[in-house]
């Protein structure tokens, strides 16, 4: 089941999935002046079997002015700059996403890709939040959001993260070492069915994640 909405927006923060559940779609969007090749794929789809998942279809962009040149190679560094990048406080070694059954890695960029990626997440997907450069994280609980199915409708849990400017940190005394408080999750789950999957895998993965470089903005 696809999630009906985007993950919640947190001021001065970006989110990223460390791995994408099977069924996730990524639209093949091209930057201005370029378009998908004729009869080209509309999206990439994370799919596969129980032992291996990968992205089906390839996104290819070509100049709007020409008809026969197709591009799908990795961008050169100067082209890469066109993509929205939000660098976090310190880089990390990415989690080995291949070890997550039923998940795909971050799809590599394609040449002349649009600056913003449009993902379609599925129920059970977890995304992780971090403050943008120049802001620091004040945690009141997990800095993550999960797409859940409740009463037949999908919703994202609210990440417990506040991003504050460096100059403002003094107004939050005692928050130097962030801790998750027991009342950190505002939503209390009712007795109705909540369909989620892969929580344990995702949570274990989150434990290894301190900071990362988010290379794309997500819609």
């Amino acid at each position: 089941e696809l999630c009906d909405d985007d993950p919640p927006e947190i001021p001065h923060a970006t989110f990223k999935a460390m791995a994408y559940k099977e069924g996730t779609m990524l639209n093949c969007e091209c930057k201005r002046g370029f378009r998908r090749i004729k009869s080209g794929s509309l999206y990439m789809l994370c799919t596969g079997n129980s032992s291996h998942s990968s992205w089906d279809n390839q996104c290819q962009c070509t100049s709007s002015a020409t008809r026969n040149t197709t591009k799908q190679v990795t961008p050169q560094p100067e082209e890469q700059k066109e993509r929205k990048t939000t660098e976090m406080q310190s880089p990390m070694q990415p989690v080995d996403q291949a070890s997550l059954p039923g998940h795909c890695r971050e799809p590599p960029p394609w040449e002349n890709e649009a600056t913003e990626r449009i993902y379609h997440f599925v129920v059970g997907q977890m995304v992780y939040y971090q403050c943008v450069q120049g802001y620091r994280a004040l945690h009141r609980g997990p800095a993550e959001s999960v797409c859940k199915m409740t009463h037949g409708k999908t919703r994202w849990t609210q990440p417990q993260l506040i991003c504050t400017g460096e100059m403002e940190t003094s107004q939050f005394p005692g928050e130097e070492k962030p801790q998750a408080s027991p009342e950190g999750r505002p939503e209390s789950e009712t007795s109705c069915l909540v369909t989620t999957t892969d929580f344990q895998i995702q949570t274990e993965m989150a434990a290894t994640m301190e900071t990362s470089i988010f290379t794309t903005e997500y819609q």
């Epitope: 696809l2 009906d4 969007e29 009869s39 509309l42 789809l45 449009i118």
Partner: antibody, heavy 117, light 104 residues
Framework: QVQLVQSGAEVKKPGASVKVSCKAS????????MHWVRQPPGQCLEWMGA????????SYSQKFEGRVTITADTSASTAYMELSSLRSEDTAVYYC??????????WGQGTTVTVSS | EIVLTQSPDFQSVTPKEKVTITCRAS?????MQWYQQKPDQSPKRLIY???KSASGVPSRFSGSGSGTDYTLTINSLEAEDAATYYC???????FGCGTKLEIK
């Protein structure tokens, strides 16, 4: 529940245009690609094109490019397919269908378009 | 452009029979989808990713194949399976021309 309800049958003269609508309900209209597929009597299914209502991105089959225009009204959760310069071989049942990624999971009931002088 | 060629075009079969429909792609593909269309109805999804059954599809329907050759198999055919079956390629949105199954 998800439903795609299409407009009624049309009879058109050669050279005219036809605009078929597809009203979606029961899901978030802007987040799924919507496709148009046609089926001439006793013939194959033919993909015509698709639209992503979230940003009005479209893709058309080369066979129909220049003659087909697919649009979406997000406020009405309705997709439209307009085919111009009609000829007799455009007589067909036209379907809208929602793209679930793996497959087209929901289809409209079909709209019969007859082109006859 | 990819062309999907189905065979046979038409098959008349008796209930409980095993039916095999093939679909050949003009170039190698990673996955194939199959749809069922009954008279005066819209197509209905049956098999996706070559061998996965869509929800609610009876277990007698199965798919297999790789590269350019793909197969839809109906084990122990039932009267309600009288329909036209189409293979479909997701990345190019190409459909085969269908195999019509008639129940004797």
């Amino acid at each position: 529940q998800v439903q795609l309800v299409q407009s009624g049958a049309e009879v058109k003269k050669p050279g005219a245009s036809v605009k078929v609508s597809c009203k979606a309900s029961g899901y978030s209209f802007t987040r799924y690609w919507m496709h148009w597929v046609r089926q001439p009597p006793g013939q194959c299914l033919e993909w015509m094109g698709a639209i992503y209502p979230g940003n009005s991105d479209t893709s058309y089959s080369q066979k129909f490019e220049g003659r087909v225009t697919i649009t979406a009204d997000t406020s009405a959760s309705t997709a439209y397919m307009e085919l111009s310069s009609l000829r007799s071989e455009d007589t067909a049942v036209y379907y809208c269908s929602r793209d679930y990624g793996y497959y087209f999971d929901f289809w409209g009931q079909g709209t019969t378009v007859t082109v006859s002088s | 452009e990819i062309v999907l060629t189905q065979s046979p075009d038409f098959q008349s079969v008796t209930p409980k029979e095993k039916v095999t429909i093939t679909c050949r792609a003009s170039s190698s593909r990673s996955y194939m989808q199959w749809y069922q269309q009954k008279p005066d109805q819209s197509p209905k999804r049956l098999i996706y990713d070559t061998s996965k059954s869509a929800s609610g599809v009876p277990s007698r329907f199965s798919g297999s194949g790789s590269g350019t050759d793909y197969t839809l198999t109906i084990n122990s055919l039932e009267a309600e399976d009288a329909a036209t079956y189409y293979c479909h390629q997701r990345s190019s949105y190409t459909f085969g021309c269908g195999t019509k199954l008639e129940i004797k």
